[in-house]
Interface confidence: medium
Amino acid sequence: SGTTNTVAAYNLTWKSTNFKTILEWEPKPVNQVYTVQISTKSGDWKSKCFYTTDTECDLTDEIVKDVKQTYLARVFSYPAGNVESTGSAGEPLYENSPEFTPYLETNLGQPTIQSFEQVGTKVNVTVEDERTLVRRNNTFLSLRDVFGKDLIYTLYYWKSSSSGKKTAKTNTNEFLIDVDKGENYCFSVQAVIPSRTVNRKSTDSPVECMGQEKGEFRE
């Protein structure tokens, strides 16, 4: 139990896409402020978003240090203007988040088709290797760098003149598919981590069609 004018945070929820990770909670504060702490299972608590009136806290900088760690966060509630005040047990009121393992749980962001090139009856479709906020040696890693062979892409393609879709899969960021000469095709891709139990697939990329400027045609 906390002080009479302070309520504990609730509905603590991790929102994470391509490792950009934000903790959200309720309620909107009335006469109170929040501070967030984050920790790994075996680590010390680190405070973030001090005495904020927001109901979200960007924890990306912490989780990208090691995306395979399991993290726990907690949100402390303090009376506005009196952040030294504590609950009856001598501690501020707080609520724990669910555990979060970024590698297993971060949503896959919507991919983008970088280019496609037709040579005769073959088309090479390239997916943009999206940059994440995970760093190694002062450089930002791509989604492929982080997930390696755990990540595949699925290509959906169809003739502009029909709705029958075909699919192809790749362990890299490139597809080489057979097409009918003289036909225009449209493409969409999806990022997939087949061995995940949650958040296995991204949303589909925007559709790109032959005859538009992303493509290139060679006899």
């Epitope: 790994t40 299972k41 075996s42 090691d66 395979k68 760690q69 399991t70 393992t101 590698y103 297993l104 062979k149 755990d150 595949i152 899969k169 362990n171 981590i193 087949p194 061995s195 995940r196």
Partner: antibody, heavy 118, light 107 residues
């Protein structure tokens, strides 16, 4: 329930080949890499290679690269490991193991004992 | 390839004892360590992945910790059914490699 069921024990002569099968059930077969790990009598575990059941692409431990071939039959959800030019030191239990997200081997077959003896 | 050095190679402890096994990687493997239990005549069984995460259904007396090159596996209170050989494995960089194993026996 995830199950990996391997073929029975084999006795081979030096120089021969052996082909061990691993039939998977209870999960989406093409969604997980299948690995092969062997264990000589009284010894530790040694990784031989892995195959992607979706594409048939494989990666082998350099130590076995010249002698091992991994294949897949999607229609029966079965992976195969063939080891050629057998020698006595290939006597071991051979396991197939499903690689989970991020790398660990979460499910293992019951093992196939291969004995190489003249 | 990355070498994994596991110690001790064998140990004997009493029921209820705290048992600790260490594994050292020849280069950093970040968080990429798994621990397995293998009972005689049986297949290995995954206990810990990502260095510290318990696999589904694994009792809480089993735990793991460490980062980089030095890792520890602990059984907080040894039970008779824990008699087995335990292996560490790095899944950070192919070829995946295992430690030599630690045989745990009851005094």
């Amino acid at each position: 329930e995830v199950q990996l069921v391997q073929s029975g024990a084999e006795v081979k002569k030096p120089g021969a080949s052996v082909k061990v099968s691993c039939k998977a059930s209870g999960y989406s077969f093409t969604g997980y890499y299948m690995n092969w790990v062997r264990q000589a009598p009284g010894q530790g575990l040694e990784w031989m290679g892995e195959i992607n059941p979706s594409t048939g692409g494989s990666t082998y431990n350099q130590k076995f690269k010249a002698r091992v071939t991994m294949t897949v039959d999607q229609s029966t959800s079965t992976v195969y490991m063939e080891l050629s030019s057998l020698r006595s030191e290939d006597t071991a239990v051979y396991y197939c193991a499903r690689r989970e997200l991020g790398g660990p081997f979460g499910y293992w077959g019951q093992g196939t004992t291969v004995t190489v003896s003249s | 390839s990355i070498q994994m050095t596991q110690s001790p190679s064998s140990l004997s402890a009493s029921v209820g004892d705290r048992v600790t096994i260490t594994c050292k990687a020849s280069q950093s493997v970040s968080q990429g360590i798994a621990w397995y239990q293998q009972k005689p005549g049986k297949s290995p069984k995954l206990l810990i992945y990502f260095a510290s995460n318990r696999y589904t259904g694994v009792p809480s007396r089993f735990s793991g910790s460490g980062y980089g090159t030095d890792f520890t596996f602990t059984i907080s209170s040894l039970q008779p059914e824990d008699i087995a050989t335990y292996y560490c494995q790095q899944d950070y960089s192919s070829p995946w490699t295992f430690g030599g194993g630690t045989k745990v026996e009851i005094k």
